[in-house]
């Protein structure tokens, strides 16, 4: 039997009020407001919180029973859709031990995981995996890619009690692995040996003069020489202009700098590697993965463009269940999503191509009607007259 | 790679008021937390405030609360710091730097560094 | 508000490893930066999160933070290593700067 710890799909219309708490940190934090969005597969079901506000801060969090993931698998899931075609903004939660204040939650507060997507800019299009382990928000070291389409997408990440972890977009897997190997929780395996420094005599030099090699005796040229083909001008003046120098020009004799033929050096050692030895600071740690208390899942987020929905969240301690959630609620609807979109997109598309077409009608009206106004009145013929008229003139 | 490149030495009466530039380049200036970090001579760095171009608010240490003002300004990529009732202990070289965000929230830039440093500015206050 | 605490100097010969301490409160807890300054130069980050290195800089340079102290390594100490060095923390939304520790490269 799955233990389901948080469950939040929005069903009950404004009852979510008095499930989730807005943080007063600050006074202008932005609001959440329940909607399905302008599209969706279902507009009752699909239903979430949605940011409303452009350019501001996020802070709303629920509370649930406090319960500890220790010797057992840990699932967060949820769904986020960015239907604003979003620039810059947070699509990520935070799960809270139950001693957070929620009333004071803000960009500090100290959370235990933090997990979901984030975009901004053209640099940032990432699915952020942090812990706090020992007081420290550890980052993983990997770059998971996040959705940055404007459809819904579901974000699930395990953390198993063997210290392995796994994130899912979609019920697809994008990620997996340790959580010793990806994230920089405990110090090094290995360090360099700080007793150990390359030997004096330690040659590095792959190649070296050859010492029976010498400079040529007609080496030694000037790099400049005074130009032999040029004449004095004739109307030169010693008195007046000084003595005449000739100008200088390239010697083409001239070799540069010579340098003795490189040999391979007899004494070379190749590249010194500095040897590496355990460190005595590291310590396996087998319960990285659990954490005492759980109580408090929170949207605590930056938004330029809001429109963002979250919805369907899940914390359980089951894969399975957590994935046939998943594909009864994002599963289920993400097909007639799409469809609905496209047909809005495409009616979007006739209606520009109308409005496209009566503005060119309108210019050619105008246009007609500026020729008119231009050309010289004449009196008034009919048709056939006009024509007898062009055909006599003929 | 984003670049900084500063304003020219500045030599101000006590009392007045200095405005240093920092332009970016190579580098998307919204993408990036920029501070400013001041050396005066022969001693170490210190942190006046800094400046999230994408989010428009500036923060500033305790110590220069009042005095300095940090702006930035997206259409020529550059920001700027201002400093206002100036003194001889204000002597100094001053750094614009800048962070990768690496994310939406306003603290991502904590976690990498600032890993571009301008060419520093010499401001000078002397009577 | 939040103090780091550096040793003025460092003296390391030539091909040795030289550890520069930054002492703090529960530093372990907060990420640590270090960054290399030469005589009439700009600051340049040589370590941040602790031990990441920024593409370019040697893999001799090393850093670990645990408990109350964080500690800059670098092994196989060349002249050109010497500089002053400034370990730098985030602390209530302000960053903080070490003294700095002068790092003398004997010889």
């Known amino acids: 039997e799955p233990a389901v710890y948080f469950k939040e799909q929005f069903l009950d219309g404004d009852g979510w009020t008095s499930r989730w708490i807005e943080s007063k940190h600050k006074s202008d934090f932005g609001k959440f407001v329940l909607s399905s969005g302008k599209f969706y597969g279902d507009e009752e079901k699909d239903k979430g919180l949605q940011t409303s506000q452009d350019a501001r801060f996020y802070a709303l969090s629920a509370s649930f029973e406090p319960f500890s993931n220790k010797g057992q698998t840990l699932v967060v899931q949820f769904t986020v859709k960015h239907e604003q075609n979003i620039d810059c903004g947070g699509g990520y939660v935070k799960l809270f031990p139950n001693s957070l204040d929620q009333t004071d939650m803000h960009g500090d507060s100290e959370y235990n995981i933090m997990f979901g997507p984030d975009i901004c800019g053209p640099g940032t299009k990432k699915v952020h995996v942090i812990f706090n382990y020992k007081g420290k928000n550890v980052l993983i070291n990997k770059d998971i890619r996040c959705k940055d389409d404007e459809f819904t997408h579901l974000y699930t990440l395990i953390v198993r009690p063997d210290n392995t972890y796994e994130v899912k977009i979609d019920n697809s897997q994008v990620e997996s692995g340790s959580l010793e190997d990806d994230w920089d929780f405990l110090p090094p395996k290995k360090i360099k040996d700080p007793d150990a420094s390359k030997p004096e005599d330690w040659d590095e030099r792959a190649k070296i003069d050859d010492p029976t090699d010498s400079k040529p005796e007609d080496w030694d040229k000037p790099e400049h020489i005074p130009d032999p083909d040029a004449k004095k001008p004739e109307d030169w003046d010693e008195e007046m202009d000084g003595e005449w120098e000739p100008p200088v020009i390239q010697n083409p004799e001239y070799k540069g700098e010579w340098k003795p033929r490189q040999i391979d050096n007899p004494d070379y050692k190749g590249t010194w590697i500095h040897p590496e030895i355990d460190n005595p600071e590291y310590s396996p740690d087998p319960s990285i993965y659990a954490y005492d208390n759980f109580g408090v899942l929170g949207l605590d987020l930056w938004q330029v463009k809001s429109g963002t929905i979250f919805d369907n969240f899940l914390i359980t301690n089951d894969e399975a269940y957590a994935e046939e959630f998943g594909n009864e609620t994002w599963g289920v609807t993400k097909a007639a999503e799409k469809q609905m979109k496209d047909k809005q997109d495409e009616e979007q598309r006739t209606r520009r191509m109308m409005r496209t077409k009566m503005r060119m009608r309108r210019m050619r009206r105008t246009r007609r009607k500026m020729r008119r106004k231009m050309s010289p009145a004449r009196p008034r013929t009919s048709c056939r007259e006009a024509c007898l008229q062009g055909w006599t003139e003929a | 790679q984003m670049q900084l490149v500063q304003s020219g030495a500045e030599v101000k009466k006590p009392g007045s008021s200095v405005k240093v530039s920092c332009k970016a380049s190579?580098?998307?200036?919204?993408?990036?937390?920029i501070s400013w970090v001041r050396q005066a001579p022969g001693q170490g760095l210190e942190w006046m405030g800094g400046?999230?171009?994408?989010?428009?608010?500036?923060n500033y240490a305790q110590k220069f609360q009042g005095r300095v003002t940090i702006t930035a300004d997206e259409s020529t990529s550059t920001a700027y710091m201002e400093l206002s009732s100036l003194r001889s202990e204000d002597t100094a070289v001053y750094y614009c730097a800048s962070s990768p965000l690496r994310g939406s929230g306003w603290y991502w830039h904590y976690y990498y560094g600032m890993d571009v440093w301008g060419q520093g500015t010499t401001v000078t206050v002397s009577s | 508000s939040y103090v780091l605490t550096q040793p003025p100097s460092v003296s390391v010969a030539p091909g040795k490893t030289a550890r520069i301490t930054c002492g703090g409160n529960?530093?372990?807890?907060?990420?640590v930066h270090w960054y290399q300054q030469k005589p009439g130069q700009s600051p340049v980050l040589v370590i941040y999160q602790d031990r990441k290195r920024p593409s370019g800089i040697p893999e001799r340079f090393s850093g670990s933070n645990s408990g109350n102290t964080a500690t800059l390594t670098i092994s196989g100490t060349q002249a050109m290593d010497e500089a002053d060095y400034y370990c730098?923390?985030?602390?209530?939304?302000?960053?903080?700067f070490g003294g700095g520790t002068k790092l003398t490269v004997l010889g």
């Open positions: 190579g580098g998307t200036f919204s993408s990036y937390a």
């Open positions: 400046i999230i171009p994408i989010f428009g608010t500036a």
């Open positions: 730098q923390v985030w602390d209530s939304s302000t960053e903080v």
């Open positions: 529960n530093i372990g807890t907060k990420s």
